[in-house]
């Protein structure tokens, strides 16, 4: 992981660019806490395991979250 260090939050920069759900290995949503006062969304890509910080306020990212949660609810009985 690049630039690992002890900080309250994880993301230095964020992206508005949508991610193809099929290329996602994992999507982490870290809620605001006493350590970091903002929501952070970290997408782990299948290719190379690259991790990206996504903008929680972006419409495209909100749509991605909806798509992923829909997919998850389909899978769960």
């Amino acid at each position: 992981v690049p630039l690992s260090r002890t900080v309250r939050c994880t993301c230095i920069s964020i992206s508005n660019q949508p991610v193809n759900p099929r290329s996602l290995e994992k999507l982490e949503i870290i809620p605001a806490s006493q350590f970091c006062p903002r929501v952070e969304i970290i997408a782990t890509m299948k290719k190379k395991g690259e991790k990206r910080c996504l903008n929680p306020e972006s419409k495209a990212i909100k749509n991605l979250l909806k798509a992923v949660s829909k997919e998850r609810s389909k899978r769960s009985p």
């Epitope: 630039l3 994880t10 991790k51 903008n55």
Partner: antibody, heavy 123, light 107 residues
Framework: QVQLVESGGGVVQPGRSLRLSCAAS????????MHWVRQAPGKGLEWVAV????????YYADSVKGRFTISRDNSKNTLYLQINSLRAEDTAVYYC????????????????WGQGTLVTVSS | DIQMTQSPSSLSASVGDRVTITCRAS??????LAWYQQKPEKAPKSLIY???SLQSGVPSRFSGSGSGTDFTLTISSLQPEDFATYYC?????????FGGGTKVEIK
């Protein structure tokens, strides 16, 4: 296109203070981590500080910790570097640079650089 | 801090030459390495990131390779505009650190 324009440099006496600015345009400043990197005359590049996209995280080189403060105003698309207790060894061209942007933790490599502003510390 | 050692510190070459610059990290940095080009009195310009990914708009004669501790920047056919100083930089861990630079001069 991406543009970064630094200002605020000049000749200043040891022990004094200075505030550098970097006006950004051509990209989504409020999404981007930003860095300051400096270069002493005839020398190589030295990373100085980083600030995250909304100003929560700041991180500094040991050589400037406690004397330099990085900050930003996203409403003005402007990055700042407050330099206190200036020393002769702070004489350098100071560049602001954009963070690459999509990597977890920020990548720490730099996409775009400003033209730089020269700070000369001399009595 | 991770030390970055570049070699050579300077080299003379002719237009059309193949030029290779090496960079060694004092400890493993995976592929978290970038290369920059700097011309006199100008700001550095990003050439390569993640050891081998070409920055948008950079000519394909530039290429990067390596991982772990040993890295290479290659210019396949040197052009007049390539005479400059080249820096490597690691971003595996804070603080980001640069090599001392390699000045490519006209033979």
């Amino acid at each position: 296109q991406v543009q970064l324009v630094e200002s605020g440099g000049g000749v200043v006496q040891p022990g004094r203070s200075l505030r550098l600015s970097c006006a950004a345009s051509g990209f989504t400043f409020s999404n981007s981590g930003m860095h300051w990197v400096r270069q002493a005359p005839g020398k190589g590049l030295e990373w100085v500080a980083v600030i995250d996209y909304d100003g929560i995280i700041q991180y500094y080189a040991d050589s400037v910790k406690g004397r330099f403060t990085i900050s930003r105003d996203n409403s003005k698309n402007t990055l700042y570097l407050q330099i206190n207790s200036l020393r002769a060894e702070d004489t350098a061209v100071y560049y602001c640079a954009t963070e690459r942007g999509t990597h977890y933790y920020g990548s720490g490599s730099f996409d775009y650089w400003g033209q730089g502003t020269l700070v000369t510390v001399s009595s | 801090d991770i030390q970055m050692t570049q070699s050579p510190s300077s080299l003379s070459a002719s237009v059309g030459d193949r030029v290779t610059i090496t960079c060694r990290a004092s400890q493993g940095i995976s592929s978290w390495l970038a290369w920059y080009q700097q011309k006199p009195e100008k700001a550095p310009k990003s050439l390569i990131y993640a050891a081998s990914s070409l920055q948008s708009g950079v000519p394909s004669r530039f290429s990067g390779s390596g991982s772990g501790t040993d890295f290479t920047l290659t210019i396949s056919s040197l052009q007049p505009e390539d005479f400059a100083t080249y820096y490597c930089q690691q971003y595996n861990s804070y603080p980001p650190t640069f090599g001392g630079g390699t000045k490519v001069e006209i033979k």
